[in-house]
């Protein structure tokens, strides 16, 4: 019996069939962040809830120390949403006063770390200028895409300013990945 | 013949192989909303087109009365975009007049209802303050993530203000889910 | 041996089993755009990197001349993010001066072209008014959803103003699709 028995004629003979319920998957949810040391010139990484509420890891996808560990090579869909909230930037007043005005911004980066490679790889970035005219503001940045990952790769979510992250609800700020 | 015949050595023997084309899937598109009564203190749920144009449901994933019905337990990727549009709020003027200013906001929630559980579960929330200075404004909120659902669970999309939803085009406001 | 041997009892007998690693997939990343002619009343299409850095196409999913070519009928998840950046719109000043004020906007459309069908189909649209009060602004629009596509369909990403697209980093602006 060959591996391509029930597959379309273009399927590679050597491609293994695979039960979907057995694939590495994780959905992590926000927790209150504690101030930690991080590398200069690198955005701080968020840490996550991995088993309570809506959060889970399964099928050898593990979470440890801010990282999702990729247990098996393949193509993964990776996603995250970070909800930010803050006080109004004074950029509109600064502008009216005629001084140069660099807008504040909020940024989310999903980063891949490969031990054999010296530099982290930025997989996804969402970045937005913030120059609100109301009092308090809040808004999400959502990211999601497919990447080819190797067993042993590690994924993390970095943000421009950890103090602006809304950690109050598990449905507002989250991070996930699943093998396709 | 064992279930893991063509699978990597780490596959569980009992995990069933499954044809992808047979999995429950739905993509729903916006329709014009009509003013209705709904539970007080709960955001109103949108209703959807499920068979015309780009919309479809398949493989026992059914749509009824604002809900997507989950026909089979498993991990689902769930997504929605809602495009909002409205007229400029007077929030900037209020601020200039020195009065306290709580900004208006737009919010989308993807909610799970389980009959055996008294309270709905908020799976995903996108929320954004709105304090625009132009005349009319418009913007989307996108959400998507993976969740473990049970057969019989129901999914809906709730919004903070149904009057602001742009119902004019099927590509602007939509809701979908598929079994992984 | 029947096709449903290891599948749940509700599986269609005729549904072929399929190795996941064999499915058509692509993740394309931004490149600097060159000014080109495009049809009047149609937003210009972006062109993309398909093999360097994070970009790839595999399993007969090909990229050519701004289009992703769909090699096989089925349900695909399609996504894109476009990061825009620009100078401040003058809409706030226009409003204060009491002149008519149409807000500027940024729009992303994922479009399907079917050779046998005269008109392109807009699958997904993200559109946002831009009326910023700071100096320079930047922000992403993210889209993603599932669609039933036919072999031979072509996908492209159109934007309202190609000159506002941030082409500087592969993680900021991207386009992808994969067979479910």
């Amino acid at each position: 019996l060959k591996g391509q028995e029930f597959a379309p004629s273009h399927q590679q003979v050597y491609a293994p069939l695979r039960a979907d319920g057995d694939k590495p998957r994780a959905h992590l949810t926000v927790v209150r962040q504690t101030p930690t040391q991080h590398f200069k010139n690198q955005f701080p990484a968020l840490h996550w809830e991995h088993e309570l509420g809506l959060a889970f890891t399964k099928n050898r996808m593990n979470y440890t120390n801010k990282f999702l560990l990729i247990p098996e090579s393949g193509d993964y869909f990776i996603y995250s949403q970070v909800t930010f909230r803050g006080m109004t930037s004074e950029c509109s007043e600064i502008r009216q006063a005629g001084r140069p005005n660099k807008p504040d911004s909020i940024t989310v980066v999903i980063t891949k770390v490969t031990d054999s490679y010296p530099e982290p790889t930025q997989l996804l970035m969402g970045t937005k200028s913030v120059c609100e005219v109301g009092s308090n503001w809040f808004q999400p940045i959502y990211l999601g895409a497919m990447f080819s990952l190797q067993e042993g790769d590690k994924l993390m979510v970095n943000v421009s300013d950890i103090s602006l992250v809304d950690y109050t609800k598990e449905d507002k700020t989250f991070f996930g990945a699943f093998l396709l | 013949l064992k279930g893991q015949e063509f699978a990597p050595s780490h596959q569980q023997v009992y995990a069933p192989l499954r044809a992808d084309g047979d999995k429950p899937r739905a993509h729903l598109t916006v329709v014009r909303q009509t003013p209705t009564q709904h539970f007080k203190n709960q955001f109103p749920a949108l209703h959807w087109e499920h068979e015309l144009g780009l919309a479809f449901t398949k493989n026992r994933m059914n749509y009824t009365n604002k809900f997507l019905l989950i026909p089979e337990s498993g991990d689902y990727f769930i997504y929605s975009q809602v495009t909002f549009r409205g007229m400029t709020s007077e929030c900037s003027e209020i601020r200039q007049a020195g009065r306290p200013n709580k900004p208006d906001s737009i919010t989308v929630v993807i909610t799970k209802v389980t009959d055996s559980y008294p309270e709905p579960t908020q799976l995903l929330m996108g929320t954004k303050s709105v304090c625009e200075v132009g005349s009319n404004w418009f913007q989307p909120i996108y959400l998507g993530a993976m969740f473990s659902l049970q057969e019989g669970d129901k999914l809906m999309v709730n919004v903070s203000d149904i009057s602001l939803v742009d119902y004019t085009k099927e590509d602007k406001t939509f809701f979908g889910a598929f079994l992984l | 041996l029947k096709g449903q041997e290891f599948a749940p009892s509700h599986q269609q007998v005729y549904a072929p089993l399929r190795a996941d690693g064999d499915k058509p997939r692509a993740h394309l990343t931004v490149v600097r755009q060159t000014p080109t002619q495009h049809f009047k009343n149609q937003f210009p299409a972006l062109h993309w990197e398909h093999e360097l850095g994070l970009a790839f196409t595999k399993n007969r999913m090909n990229y050519t001349n701004k289009f992703l070519l769909i090699p096989e009928s089925g349900d695909y998840f399609i996504y894109s993010q476009v990061t825009f950046r620009g100078m401040t719109s003058e809409c706030s000043e226009i409003r204060q001066a009491g002149r008519p004020n149409k807000p500027d906007s940024i729009t992303v459309v994922i479009t399907k072209v079917t050779d046998s069908y005269p008109e392109p189909t807009q699958l997904l649209m993200g559109t946002k008014s831009v009326c910023e009060v700071g100096s320079n602004w930047f922000q992403p629009i993210y889209l993603g959803a599932m669609f039933s596509l036919q072999e031979g369909d072509k996908l492209m990403v159109n934007v309202s103003d190609i000159s506002l697209v941030d082409y500087t980093k592969e993680d900021k602006t991207f386009f992808g699709a994969f067979l479910l």
Epitope: - | P35, D104, V130, D161, I162, S163 | -
Partner: antibody, heavy 117, light 106 residues
Framework: EVHLLESGGGLVQPGGSLRLSCAAS????????MSWVRQAPGKGLEWVSG????????YYADSVKGRFTISRDNSKNTLYLQMNSLRAENTAVYYC??????????WGQGTMVTVSS | DIQMIQSPSSLSASVGDSVTITCRAS??????LNWYQQKPGKAPKFLIY???SLQSGVPSRFSGSGSGTDFTLTISSLQPEDFATYYC????????FGQGTRLEIK
Amino acid sequence: EVHLLESGGGLVQPGGSLRLSCAASGFTFSSYAMSWVRQAPGKGLEWVSGISGGGGSTYYADSVKGRFTISRDNSKNTLYLQMNSLRAENTAVYYCAIEMAGAFDIWGQGTMVTVSS
Amino acid sequence: DIQMIQSPSSLSASVGDSVTITCRASQSISYYLNWYQQKPGKAPKFLIYAASSLQSGVPSRFSGSGSGTDFTLTISSLQPEDFATYYCQQSYSSITFGQGTRLEIK
């Protein structure tokens, strides 16, 4: 059934004030934006003012800005329009309407406001 | 503000006729145009949204078309109850109505 009922119209002298009310029933009032639209005798329709479902955002036509104030009490399912410094040109039938993404789905029957000395 | 100009201001037609009313915007309003019908002494009734989509319960003899600056409302086979005044309304930038078109029995 969705129903809107305006009240508070009447005769008022130029420079005077009037407060219109619109009682809503049959739908979850707090989830819908509302507007006031007026129609002068023998003339066309003119949008006057709007308010978001939560009441945090208000919108006005230039012709009434600074003189009219729209508000709502979601606990009473009631919309209001406070009209000050009234002028003869404000004479009209005032309708309240449910606004859905810039269109007016459902209208009340209207209340007549006459500004005259 | 965006001006909406309807034409004609009035027209006469007979039962069974087909009539077209035009609405022109002073600048592009995409497809954000709505149509209403009003009978004497009554509140307006919502007919068409997004330039061409029929509100539920509205007879299919009513149709709308157009985008950008030029729009039309067509009534394909006039019925006695269709004689009324018709208004267009844009919601692209703030809200403005056309001046109305009065449709009378010939």
